[in-house]
């Protein structure tokens, strides 16, 4: 039975040209995290594998940095980066847990972080 929950940074906003950290955390389970995939809508951004380490998709290499931890740092943000991001935790023996983050990239300096929330 899957007992874990994913906590994410929730709905966040950031300024155009700036950077942002996408962070997820899996709790309430003893399952082993074997891999975390980061996706932006229908694009694979990066993978962090427990044995192989990080793989950043070549088309995002200039603007995506691994970490901190299992998180992902997006740099040189553009308005086109606005949208949904998913952290997909592959675990053993539980299976797959998915967290969702919505990022809004703003032109002005009114960006602020939203509250944390949980996805079961």
């Amino acid at each position: 039975m899957m007992t874990g929950t994913i906590e994410t940074t929730g709905n966040i906003s950031a300024e155009k040209g700036g950077s942002i950290i996408l962070q997820c955390h899996l709790s309430s389970t003893t399952a082993q995290v074997t891999q975390v995939n980061w996706e932006q809508q229908d694009q694979l951004l990066a993978i962090c594998n427990a044995d192989l380490g990080w793989h950043i998709s070549p088309s995002f290499k200039d603007r995506v940095a691994p970490g901190p931890g299992l998180g992902l740092t997006l740099q040189s943000l553009t308005v086109n980066d606005t949208g949904e991001y998913f952290c997909i935790y592959h675990t053993y023996p539980d299976g797959t847990y998915t967290g969702r983050i919505f990022l809004e990239v703003l032109e002005s300096s009114v960006a602020e972080h939203g509250a944390r929330f949980q996805i079961p």
Epitope: T34, Q35, E39, D42, Q43, L44, I47, N49, D51, L52, H55, S57, S59, H90, Y92, P93
Partner: antibody, heavy 118, light 107 residues
């Protein structure tokens, strides 16, 4: 240099058994998931089975479930496919392939031919 | 199971031609789509992974695009060594599935 070398293929009668091996070298075998993929004569590619790096998770195509068993011995850097209750439609070249990040198959063996016929 | 439909099943082209092969998934697979080249009597060779990433050592005339359900493999200028069969494969979920293949022949 990454190398995958299959062996164990041959001619077997319907209902018989065969065990394929895939000897891996040139990389840290236990860090990678591995798959078996087959190709019937003149046909396309068909995924058969996969196993995680630790061997804790295994996956099968419906066509072989209950008849084939995938396993690995990380101390010997070897992948196995135990094939029981073989049928004529299992006749194919069987390839082992390395699967980094469980997303793509970047290295393949040369294949071993399994022929099921009476 | 996710069905992968490749088209065309075969095509004839000349050296220097631009060739496009398409692959459609029966449901969204994000960008978990790979392309392989296979020559007669040989093992498949990875060309493109995760829809658009060029595998190391593969010539830049090969490119991949698409996401969701529709994907494309393009060979910008066909070379003599490119005459082969090409397969797409989804790795979004098990069972992993391949397209039926596209045979690229000399015109």
């Amino acid at each position: 240099e990454v190398q995958l070398l299959e062996s164990g293929g041959g001619l077997v009668q319907p209902g018989g058994s065969l065990r394929l091996s895939c000897a891996a070298s040139g990389f840290t075998f236990s860090s990678y998931s591995m798959s078996w993929v087959r190709q019937a004569p003149g046909k396309g590619l068909e995924w058969v089975s996969a196993i995680s790096g630790s061997g804790g998770s295994t996956y099968y195509a419906d066509s072989v479930k209950g008849r084939f068993t995938i396993s690995r011995d990380n101390s010997k850097n070897t992948l196995y496919l135990q094939m029981n209750s073989l049928r004529a439609e299992d006749t194919a070249v069987y390839y082992c392939a390395r699967e980094p990040y469980d997303v793509w198959m970047d290295y393949w063996g040369q294949g071993t031919l399994v022929t099921v016929s009476s | 199971d996710i069905q992968m439909t490749q088209s065309p099943s075969s095509l004839s082209a000349s050296v220097g031609d631009r060739v496009t092969i398409t692959c459609r998934a029966s449901q969204s697979i994000s960008s978990y789509l790979n392309w392989y080249q296979q020559k007669p009597g040989k093992a498949p060779k990875l060309l493109i992974y995760a829809a658009s990433s060029l595998q190391s050592g593969v010539p830049s005339r090969f490119s991949g695009s698409g996401s969701g359900t529709d994907f494309t493999l393009t060979i910008s200028s066909l070379q003599p060594e490119d005459f082969a069969t090409y397969y797409c494969q989804q790795s979004y979920s098990t069972p992993l599935t391949f397209g039926g293949g596209t045979k690229v022949e000399i015109k």
